[in-house]
């Protein structure tokens, strides 16, 4: 029986060019965490395996840093990073727990200001 719950940072926003921490926390279970996956759409961004540690997708290694803890830090954000992110906890004996975070990457206020007052 799965008794655990996942708490996440929920819906978050950040400025283009900045960084953000995606954080999930599994509580209310004594199950052993064997691996945590961080996913965007249906692709793996990173994994943290209990035995093997962190692995980051080569496509994201320049912009993704492991941690803090089992979280994930996204750097040099672009508007294309906007979307759903999932933390997936593989546990024994409970099974799989999934948390969802929606990230919105906003144009920086400086960029918005500049675009609004462009000189023809």
């Amino acid at each position: 029986m799965m008794t655990g719950t996942i708490e996440t940072t929920g819906n978050i926003s950040a400025e283009k060019g900045g960084s953000i921490i995606l954080q999930c926390h599994l509580s209310s279970t004594t199950a052993q965490v064997t691996q945590v996956n961080w996913e965007q759409q249906d692709q793996l961004l990173a994994i943290c395996n209990a035995d093997l540690g962190w692995h980051i997708s080569p496509s994201f290694k320049d912009r993704v840093a492991p941690g803090p803890g089992l979280g994930l830090t996204l750097q040099s954000l672009t508007v294309n990073d906007t979307g759903e992110y999932f933390c997936i906890y593989h546990t024994y004996p409970d099974g799989t727990y999934t948390g969802r975070i929606f990230l919105e990457v906003l144009e920086s206020s400086v960029a918005e200001h500049g675009a609004r007052f462009q000189i023809p």
């Epitope: 692709q43 793996l44 093997l52």
Partner: nanobody
Framework: QVQLAESGGGSVQAGGSLRLSCAAS????????MGWFRQAPGKEREGVAV????????YYTDSVKGRFTISQDNAKNTLYLQMNSLKPEDTAMYYC??????????????????WGQGTQVTVSS
């Protein structure tokens, strides 16, 4: 959404052969890791064989090397597992699995997000 449907399981004597098939729908032209996993009663699901569709790289667990062969038919979007010299310890439910893009440890069940319903393979001595 990717959907996977296995077939070809059955009962066979030790030393015999079976060919499993996995029909995949919803698979795009992107690179995928597609593989076969198995789970015997009371045991954890384990990776058997995986193929990367982009470059046809293959990965096998040690216990099946030289006996099992994974292959794909891109035109039919079908994955195969040819199993020869079967042993009683190969008895298990066999599952087809897939993941688009990067997979750090191809034979780890934790790295796949699309799964079929499974097909039973029973090898008697």
């Amino acid at each position: 959404q990717v959907q996977l449907a296995e077939s070809g399981g059955g009962s066979v004597q030790a030393g015999g052969s079976l060919r499993l098939s996995c029909a995949a729908s919803g698979v795009t032209s992107d690179s995928y890791h597609m593989g076969w996993f198995r789970q015997a009663p009371g045991k954890e699901r384990e990776g058997v064989a995986v193929i990367k569709t982009g470059d046809a790289s293959t990965y096998y667990t040690d216990s099946v090397k030289g006996r099992f062969t994974i292959s794909q038919d891109n035109a039919k979007n079908t994955l195969y597992l040819q199993m020869n010299s079967l042993k009683p310890e190969d008895t298990a439910m066999y599952y087809c699995a897939a993941r688009r893009g990067w997979v750090p440890a191809p034979l780890s069940q934790y790295n796949y997000n699309y799964w079929g319903q499974g097909t039973q393979v029973t090898v008697s001595s």
